[in-house]
């Protein structure tokens, strides 16, 4: 049969409120070496159990009888420390248990999830959460909005998520937990109303270095908007903005555009390149959510101005020209020059030279027409650039090199009759 | 010395539920927890879960939640574990085990086959 | 909850032999417990509180470790211990066991 227990005081019970400080304790009488005192809370060993021990002996012999004490400090009561308590030690071959103490928690509500502050576009519907527990239980919730009760008594409403259909000025929540104890108030959330994001974000139209673009702005409760904001960005290759990014990977060009009109030019943009933009409208609650980002392009342009360098000279019944690129934007993609030149009393001759940048012209009359000018234009899908101003065709002198080149013959009949070519040409002399 | 008897085999069929009793000797049963560790064939230990005699209280592992209940009999030192809808997966030998922060004393096991 | 992984699964040593059986949990432990069970009967504790030998059992078990690693020795190895070996922990709820080793004897 078994020995008779050496425990001779039990651990008591304890019941509190969350955050109570309490100490269990219990003492058992022992012959020879004290055993370690071990804690068991509903059957498992405490492992950081906050527990002292104080041994004394009742005698001057090692062998005499000892009295142990273990106290276990319970520092700071929550609901994980409620249960059955019990001293557990291990004597010899055998293993003895005190009887157990119970160590439970009951006060007002305690709140696992509170009312958080968020902003809500206007009108818009958003949920609510609030999570309080006891014991003792039933924990019942009441809502309250700006204050007042959203039910008529605890528990009848809605009780872990309030389901607000929209809001169109900002408001405050807070939820009331009520058990047999008394009542707790969760913290006050704020819900801050803002404008709806914008719709409808479009282009109007487009110049080589400026976009017209316009919205429709959403609801924003009873709060007048005050500006609009329009952000473009270059939309780079492997920027992206196409895959959702969310901001852009580089300084946007940001304009504010005062409200109605919901209306916007963007000015000193590229020519002939790709954007993306999107817009977000503020209240004097705060901004609204930016649309998505909006692919635009500028369009083509024509250059901005005359190729430079350009050097003419005549040997005989052959003209040489050659020129540079233009130093000014060329606003798209060059497609080519075109030349005109012209005598004092011949009419002038158009000539589209594509992209290369020299031509030798072969003269009709052995070169003997007088005061020869030369023109160059260069031009992109949207039309030719400014011409250069004349530049007269000078003689060859020996020693000036002549760069083979392909001659560019006129027709023998008419003189000086060359097609014009269906493009702009600006007279310039 | 302390000693743990349980019931003998069952067969039971799909659906049917199945109660294993562990008879405690040479201890105070009420101070003690009682567990239950079940293994299937050729496999590991698996905790059930406790009651403690001396109250009634219980704690079941989350597996076997809504389908097992431990009981006592204070006055014959028994302490019982029911496990319904039985399923053929539930084949296993079924240990009860005293428990003082680990299992020192173990019953000799109680068969319980899950065949239709 | 915490897994336990023992190594090796399956052991086959000559008696006289030292044999070490680790437990690995999954996350930090206290203490842990090992059981043996030899076959067609029910586990018997070896070793409570990591270090302390059960009511019974020979000097030539022990047990050892901390944190996540854990290690049961058998000193010099006899016929009686051939046996399925269990490592088990109660730091938290539920408690687990380890798969198991079993010890086959040469």
């Known amino acids: 049969q078994a020995e008779e227990s050496p425990f001779v005081g039990n651990p008591g019970n304890i019941t509190g409120a969350r955050g109570l400080t309490g100490t269990l304790r219990c003492q058992l009488q022992v012959q020879g070496e004290p055993p370690e005192v071990h804690w068991l809370r509903d059957g498992q060993i405490l492992e950081l159990a906050d527990s002292t021990q104080t041994q004394v002996p009742l005698g001057e012999d090692e062998q005499d009888d000892w009295i142990v004490v273990s106290q276990l400090r319970i520092t700071s009561l929550q609901l994980s420390d409620t249960g059955q308590y019990q001293c557990l030690v291990f004597l010899g071959h055998q293993t003895f248990v005190s009887q157990p103490g119970y160590v439970g928690l009951e006060g007002l509500p305690y709140f696992l999830e509170e009312p958080e502050d968020r902003t809500v576009a206007a009108n818009t519907p958003f949920n609510l959460s609030c999570q309080a527990q006891g014991p003792p239980e039933p924990v019942d919730l009441l809502w309250l909005q700006d204050a007042v009760p959203l039910a008529t008594a605890p528990g009848h409403g809605p009780q872990r998520s309030l389901h607000v259909p929209g809001l169109n000025k900002t408001s405050s929540f807070s939820c009331e937990a009520h058990n047999a104890k008394g009542v707790t108030t969760s913290r006050t959330a704020t819900i801050t109303v803002l404008p709806q994001q914008p719709r409808n974000l479009h282009l109007v139209s487009r110049q080589p270095t400026e976009l017209e673009v316009a919205w429709t702005p959403g609801l924003s409760g009873i709060y007048p908007l005050t500006h609009c904001t329009l952000q473009a960005v270059l939309s780079d290759d492997g920027m992206g903005i196409q895959a959702g990014e969310p901001d852009p990977p580089e300084e946007p060009l940001t304009s504010q555009a005062s409200v109605p009109p919901h209306q916007l030019r963007l000015g000193s943009l590229h020519p002939h390149t790709p954007y993306h933009i999107r817009v977000a409208c503020t209240s004097s609650q705060g901004p609204s959510s930016w649309t998505h980002w909006l692919p635009v392009e500028t369009p083509e342009g024509v250059p901005l101005g005359p190729p430079e360098n350009i050097s003419a000279t005549r040997n005989g019944s052959q003209a040489f020209v050659h020129w540079q690129e233009p130093r000014a934007p060329l606003q798209g993609t060059l497609l080519g020059y075109r030349l005109a030149y012209q005598g004092q009393d011949t009419p002038e001759v158009l000539m589209d030279i594509g992209l290369r940048q020299e031509v030798t012209l072969e003269l009709q009359g052995d070169g003997s027409v007088s005061n020869l000018t030369v023109c160059v234009a260069a031009y992109t899908a949207a039309g030719d650039g400014p011409w250069s101003l004349p530049v007269p065709l000078e003689a060859w002198r020996p020693g000036q090199a002549q760069p083979v080149h392909q001659l560019v013959k006129e027709p023998s009949t008419p003189a000086f009759s060359w097609p014009h070519h269906h493009h702009h040409h600006h007279h310039h002399h | 010395q302390v000693q743990l008897v349980q019931s003998g085999a069952e067969v039971k069929k799909p659906g049917a539920s199945v109660k294993v009793s562990c008879k405690a000797s040479g201890y105070p049963f009420t101070d003690f927890y009682i567990n239950w560790v079940r293994q299937a064939p050729g496999q590991g230990l698996e905790w059930m879960g406790w009651i403690y005699p001396g109250s009634g209280n219980t704690k079941y592992n989350e597996k076997f939640k809504g389908r097992v209940t431990m009981t006592r009999d204070t006055s014959i030192s028994t302490a019982y574990m029911e496990l319904s809808r039985l399923r053929s997966d539930d084949t296993a030998v079924y240990y009860c085990?005293?428990?003082?922060?680990?299992?020192?004393?173990w019953g000799q096991g109680t068969l319980v086959t899950v065949s239709s | 909850q915490i897994v336990l992984t023992q190594s090796p699964d399956f052991q086959s040593v000559t008696p006289k032999e030292k044999v070490t059986i680790t437990c690995s949990a999954s996350?930090?432990?206290?203490?842990m417990y090992w059981y043996q069970q030899k076959p067609d009967q029910s586990p018997k504790s070896l070793i409570y509180l990591t270090s302390n030998l059960a009511s019974g059992v020979p000097s030539r078990f022990s047990g050892s470790g901390s944190g996540t690693d854990y290690t049961l020795t058998i000193n010099s190895l006899e016929a009686e211990d051939a046996a399925t070996y269990y490592c088990?922990?109660?730091?938290?709820?539920?408690?687990?066991f380890g798969q198991g080793t079993k010890l086959e004897i040469k």
């Open positions: 088990q922990q109660w730091s938290s709820n539920p408690p687990t």
């Open positions: 996350s930090s432990i206290g203490y």
């Open positions: 085990a005293r428990s003082t922060g680990f299992f020192d004393y």
